[in-house]
């Protein structure tokens, strides 16, 4: 066989044995002559250079450029490729020689008592165990241990080639510690040398430092950095570290393998760097490198070393936070410090604790901010080592989009008598107060009778052509009063009123309030009727268990068939045509009520009496009357509110006090409840009677004792009682000083 590229002028060296393969018996002599056109050299198996003693290369006697290779008494190990080549060229001729030695069918490597085969556990990779044969057509199998397994050539992925060795998928022998080839010749077994199986992996999945970031220490503390390398199986790892003062004398490095769960396809290695008594010069970048030989991965972290523990606020710390009701508010405590400070939040001086609505930690989080969250929040940072404290105040301002109080009355609003003067009110609560409140109007029929529009809960009046109240052509004459400000339920509210000079036309009125964070609106149904009129007897909101009468009065000459109904709880109408009020057109939602009819000279009066009114009696009451001539129905609606009975409670400044003789004492006892409670005063459990020195005012709410004497000292009790029970508060009045005896002073007497 020839090897290399033919040269222009040179022929290949010519061998005396013109074969690719030569088979000879052991103990015979091998002799091959090589002739050429320039200086020649021989290469032979095992020892590739000319130092082998048994091999003789001699110049030919009969010519230039000719060399003979001679090996007397060949052995199986002489099997292999014999190459004759021109010096300094690739031009060569090769013959493969088998030395058949049935006692030693495998060629042994000169130096090895055992060999090493490196494999990976890759399913697609094959490995060659180099058990070459001195006989080309042996039956060879591969033995692996432990446990013992035998692999036989299958004509596919498992094969044996005398020139190459035994080829097998590497994963099949990855479990084994060692393998060897075995040949059977005439029932005799011959074994190759042992090959140690070394399974190699190389891939590093990642290198992770722990802590991974934000490492801060102060001088003298201990630094411990862990570096974990995750690798595929059968990988060995070298670790190395790079850091500012690599020559550190207090440095300690520990490398170890970590246990991984059986069945895991991963291996973990850990390297720990420890520096005791860290110094400022140790501040800087720390890098850990892990290397398997074929792959290196690195990771870095910065270590900050402080001179001493400290705490300070960061520059980005806010002083004012603005939010809108319902939003989530996050106020981060931005700090610089080592070690991380303890963080405590206070609101108006009171410590805040975390719960489902508020989380007080590194970040103060208010889940759904409300008005009551407005205030000054103080964050106090405390260094856990030095106990140094730093505080910072953050003002939280919670804005409220305009809310219109009357909006909660979502039932059809009362009807208004034709020709009367009426006042419509919008009471707006907003923070900041609304910068404007505008009124708009629209004729009732324009809005109510458009079935093309769908109605939604958020917009029950889908009217589009709202007109400014300045333009009241075709409507009622209107005047908008200047906004007023009132303290209602402890809140500053803006009240806007619209005065309708004469109720001539049924219309819808809308007030719209706008502030910096939103807008609110209220639509008022202003239904004008020429029909009956409803009055309440007595003319005030009843409390539970009180009696009330609803009177419906109608001109007898115009109306007939007076009937009382109650408007039942109704789902939101589907069609716009049913909105807003003409309840007369939709009697399905009305419950007929029993009532008593009275008459006077001009009117019929239908009285519907509610004895022992309950909260269930609240709602909209409809009086229906029929026009005698046209038979058209006229409806009037009146909303009835029943106040809940509330047991008495007392608020006020009744507290123990010390007074000097001759001075005055003024105390108040404010009671609330429904029905309103009666207030009584007692001294030392006896009823306090008014006289010249003891004055009770404002329904006994305020007690004044003028020019007190020693005998005024005692236990004073304010008691508020109603049918629902009593509430009381007590205070002890101490009178100090000596009593002057004088006839001029005719002092009051109690009891």
């Amino acid at each position: 066989a020839s090897v290399g590229l033919p040269s222009v002028s040179l022929d290949l060296p010519r061998l005396s044995i013109q074969k690719d393969i030569l088979t000879i018996k052991a103990n015979t002599t091998l002799q091959i002559t090589c002739r050429g056109q320039r200086d020649l050299d021989w290469l032979w198996p095992n020892n590739q250079s000319g130092s082998e003693q048994r091999v003789e290369v001699t110049e030919c006697s009969d010519g230039l450029f000719c060399k003979t290779l001679t090996i007397p008494k060949v052995i199986g190990n002489d099997t292999g490729a014999y190459k004759c080549f021109y010096r300094e060229t690739d031009l060569a001729s090769v013959i493969y020689v088998y030395v058949q030695d049935y006692r030693s069918p495998f060629i042994a490597s000169v130096s090895d008592q055992h060999g090493v085969v490196y494999i990976t556990e890759n399913k697609n990779k094959t490995v060659v165990i180099p058990c070459l044969g001195s006989i080309s057509n042996l039956n060879v199998s591969l033995c692996a241990r432990y446990p013992e397994k035998r692999f036989v050539p299958d004509g596919n992925r498992i094969s044996w080639d005398s020139k190459k060795g035994f080829t097998i998928p590497s994963y099949m022998i990855s479990y084994a510690g060692m393998v060897f080839c075995e040949a059977k010749i005439n029932d005799e077994s011959y074994q190759s040398i042992m090959y140690i199986v070394v399974v190699v992996g190389y891939r590093i999945y990642d290198v992770v430092l722990s802590p991974s970031h934000g490492i801060e220490l102060s001088v003298g503390e201990k630094l411990v950095l862990n570096c974990t390398a995750r690798t595929e199986l059968n990988v060995g790892i070298d670790f190395n570290w790079e850091y500012p003062s690599s020559k550190h004398q207090h440095k300690k490095l520990v490398n170890r393998d970590l246990k991984t769960q059986s069945g895991s396809e991963m291996k973990k290695f850990l390297s720990t760097l420890t520096i005791d008594g860290i110094t400022r010069s140790d501040q800087g970048l720390y890098t850990c490198a892990a290397s398997s030989g074929l792959m290196t991965k690195k990771n870095s972290t910065f270590v900050r070393v402080h001179e001493k523990p400290f705490v300070a606020f960061g520059s980005g710390m806010e002083s004012l936070v603005e939010a809108t009701v319902g939003e989530r508010v996050r106020i981060p405590a931005k700090y610089l410090g080592y070690p991380p400070p303890e963080i405590k939040w206070y609101k108006n001086g009171i410590p805040l604790e975390s719960n489902h609505t508020i989380k007080a930690g590194h970040v103060l989080t208010i889940m759904e901010v409300s008005e009551r969250d407005t205030g000054n929040y103080t964050v106090i940072l405390t260094n856990p080592i030095s106990k140094e404290k730093q505080s910072h105040v953050v003002s939280l301002v919670v804005y409220v989009p305009p809310q219109i109080g009357e909006k909660s009355l979502i039932s059809p609003v009362d009807s208004y008598q034709y020709g009367t003067t009426q006042t419509l009110t919008c009471t707006v609560y907003a923070i900041p107060p609304p910068h404007h409140i505008h009124w708009y109007w629209q004729l009732e029929e324009e809005c109510a009778n458009e079935p093309s529009h769908a109605v939604s809960v958020t917009n029950p009046y889908p009217c589009e052509e709202w007109r400014s109240v300045e333009d009241f052509q075709g409507g009622n004459k209107i005047e908008v009063n200047k906004n007023q400000f009132a303290l209602i339920e402890g809140k500053n509210k803006t009240v806007s009123t619209l005065v309708i000079q004469a109720a001539n036309v049924s219309a819808l009125y809308k007030c719209e309030a706008v502030n910096k964070v939103g807008r609110g609106e209220r639509v008022i149904s202003f239904h004008v009727t020429r029909g009956p009129e409803i009055t309440l007897q007595p003319d005030m909101q009843p409390t539970e268990q009180e009696s009330v009468s609803l009177w419906c009065t109608a001109d007898r000459s115009t109306f007939e068939n007076l009937t009382w109904y109650k408007l039942g709880p109704q789902p939101l109408p589907i069609h716009v045509g049913e909105l807003p009020t003409p309840v007369c057109k939709n009697l399905d939602t009305l419950w007929k009520l029993n009532a008593t009819m009275f008459s006077n000279s001009t009117n019929d009066i239908l009285i519907m009496e509610l004895k022992n009114a309950s909260l269930q009696d609240q709602g909209d009451y409809v009086c229906l009357a029929q026009d005698r001539k046209t038979k058209k129905r006229h409806c009037v609606v009146r909303q009835l509110t029943v106040l809940e009975r509330v047991a008495p409670t007392i608020t006020g400044n009744l507290e123990n006090q010390t007074t000097s003789i001759g001075e005055s004492i003024e105390v108040s006892c404010t009671a609330s409840g429904n029905p309103p409670p009666q207030i009584m005063w007692f001294k030392d459990n006896e009823t306090l009677v008014e006289d010249s020195g003891i004055v009770l005012k404002d329904g006994n709410r305020n007690l004044t004792i003028r020019r007190v004497r020693k005998e005024d000292e005692g236990l004073y009790t304010c008691q508020a009682c109603s049918v629902l029970g009593c509430a009381k508060v007590e205070a002890f009045f101490i009178i100090e000083g000596a009593q002057e005896k004088t006839n001029l002073e005719h002092h009051h007497h109690h009891h």
């Epitope: 990976t120 890759n122 697609n124 990779k125 190699v200 190389y202 891939r203 999945y205 060995g236 790892i237 070298d238 670790f239 190395n240 790079e242 890098t287 490198a289 892990a290 290397s291 398997s292 030989g293 074929l294 792959m295 290196t296 991965k297 690195k298």
Partner: antibody, heavy 117, light 112 residues
Amino acid sequence: EVQLVESGGGLVKPGGSLRLSCAASGFTFSMYGMSWVRQAPGKRLEWVASISIGGSYTYYADSVKGRFTISRDNAKNTLYLQMNSLRAEDTAVYYCARELDGNYDYWGQGTTLTVSS
Amino acid sequence: DIVITQTPLSLPVTPGESVSISCRSSKSLLYKDGKTYLNWFLQRPGQSPQLLIYLMSTRASGVPDRFSGSGSGTDFTLKISRVEAEDVGVYYCQQLVEYPFTFGSGTKLEIK
């Protein structure tokens, strides 16, 4: 600036030995895996051997296994390739390369080895 | 070993035009970590190889964005848009999914 400078190449007879060196500068040598890659005249690049950062783990191409030894001296910032039993087919330009994440991100200019009698 | 085949062997181009070099692997280079371990190198005349692209499509630092890598598990492409005179040389692809790491036969880019 990262620099890798190979040396030690030359002409050697078949069966002979030679040691190549690669002097590294401009980076922390002990934090990178190192490799030798060769290129025979007119042939493709061929990976030869690799070594881990501490020198504990080495890998070789089948064609050089048992004949070549890769080593490193981190104190001297130097990589070595000891080549024994050299063959004509080992004739090539030998490059040393820096490795990170398996990638050869910097290479030396190369040193030429010729194996010939 | 994984065999890497590159086409074409030679690629004459005019400066300013765009070219593509193909590389095919005898086995998928998509590893179980979801990354494709294929690199591209450029060896300029008389110089050592320079890493251009790693993990199939990530440009090495300092490599102009005219160079882009793409591909699937076994078929890969290096695209050079607007070829410049300094881009001449031999382009090699290399697989890193399985040891021993092997290189493609190279594609010689030359100016017409």
